[in-house]
């Protein structure tokens, strides 16, 4: 035999009280699947958090983090201060990058410049706190007729042989 | 036990008002989340109003918005529905329901009462 409460769509649960007739979810609530015995209670965008789609009786509130802060975990369920360019999150707040480090986001650890001589590359533009360290051309790079680029014929006008 | 008495309802013409009550015992409405649904002639049930986080905030459906009111009084422990420039889409049993928060974290309602009808026509 057929389960009754498989009849009930989202947006309603089964209800034994009434002979397993579909019942609305209350409000508040929502059922995002058909046949279930209850709705589940809509998350709350709370606080820190504020609501990013609002929750209906088949699927659930979602929430995104005020200005300032950033969505960490499934579903967005922790918030995050942000920091500046060129800071970290720490457990006493916003700290500069120590030298030598940089952070070029909101979020996130200071991580270290890239050593442009493990690749055996000069460094062309020094790093800051904000932007890591832009290496050059290998000085083997910049040895005469060391260049892979070959420059283009000069261009001949037509009807003309070459001398 | 739970019970639920609504009263009030009546035949009505457009744009009539009425106000239904909702005489609760065996729990206090001032701190529960109760409200009321309707089943129109062959339709199912839809939730109208209800007063959600213990009085906190309330829920109106987008049909009734701006023209019923959903209140309590805490002492005489009942419900009422104020309901005002009335439409024949009105026409319905109206019940009084307790909303019902399950340990598991699901939710779900009680009516237990009869329901009272209200009927829109001119």
């Known amino acids: 035999l057929q389960d009754p409460c498989s009849n009930c769509p989202a947006g309603t649960f089964c209800d034994n009280n009434r002979n397993q007739i579909c019942s609305p979810c209350p409000p508040n609530s929502f059922s995002s699947a058909g046949g279930q015995r209850t709705c589940d209670i809509c998350r709350q965008c709370k606080g820190v958090f504020r609501t990013r789609k609002e929750c209906s009786s088949t699927s659930n509130a979602e929430c995104d983090c005020t200005p300032g802060f950033h969505c960490l975990g499934a579903g967005c369920s922790m918030c995050e201060q942000d920091c500046k360019q060129g800071q970290e999150l720490t457990k006493k707040g916003c700290k500069d990058c120590c030298f030598g480090t940089f952070n070029d986001q909101k979020r996130g650890i200071c991580r270290p410049w890239t050593n442009c001589s493990l690749d055996g590359k000069s460094v062309l533009v020094n790093g800051t706190k904000e932007r890591d360290v832009v290496c050059g051309p290998s000085p083997a790079d910049l040895s005469p007729g060391a260049s892979s680029v070959t420059p283009p014929a000069p261009a001949r006008e037509p009807g003309h042989s070459p001398q | 036990e739970v019970q639920l008495l609504e009263s009030g309802g009546g035949l009505v013409q457009p744009g009539g008002s009425l106000r239904l009550s909702c005489a609760a015992s065996g729990f206090t409405v001032s701190a529960e989340d109760v409200g009321w649904v309707r089943q129109a002639p062959g339709k199912g049930l839809e939730w109208v109003s209800a007063i959600l986080d213990k009085g906190g905030s309330t829920y109106y459906a987008e049909s009734v918005k701006g023209r019923f009111t959903i209140s309590r009084d805490n002492a005489k422990n009942t419900l009422y529905l104020q309901m005002s420039s009335l439409r024949a889409e009105d026409t319905a049993v109206y019940y009084c329901?307790?909303?019902?928060?399950?340990?598991?974290?699901?939710?779900?309602?009680?009516?237990r009462g009869q329901g009272t009808q209200v009927t829109v026509s001119s």
């Open positions: 329901a307790r909303i019902v928060y399950h340990a598991g974290g699901g939710v779900t309602f009680d009516t």
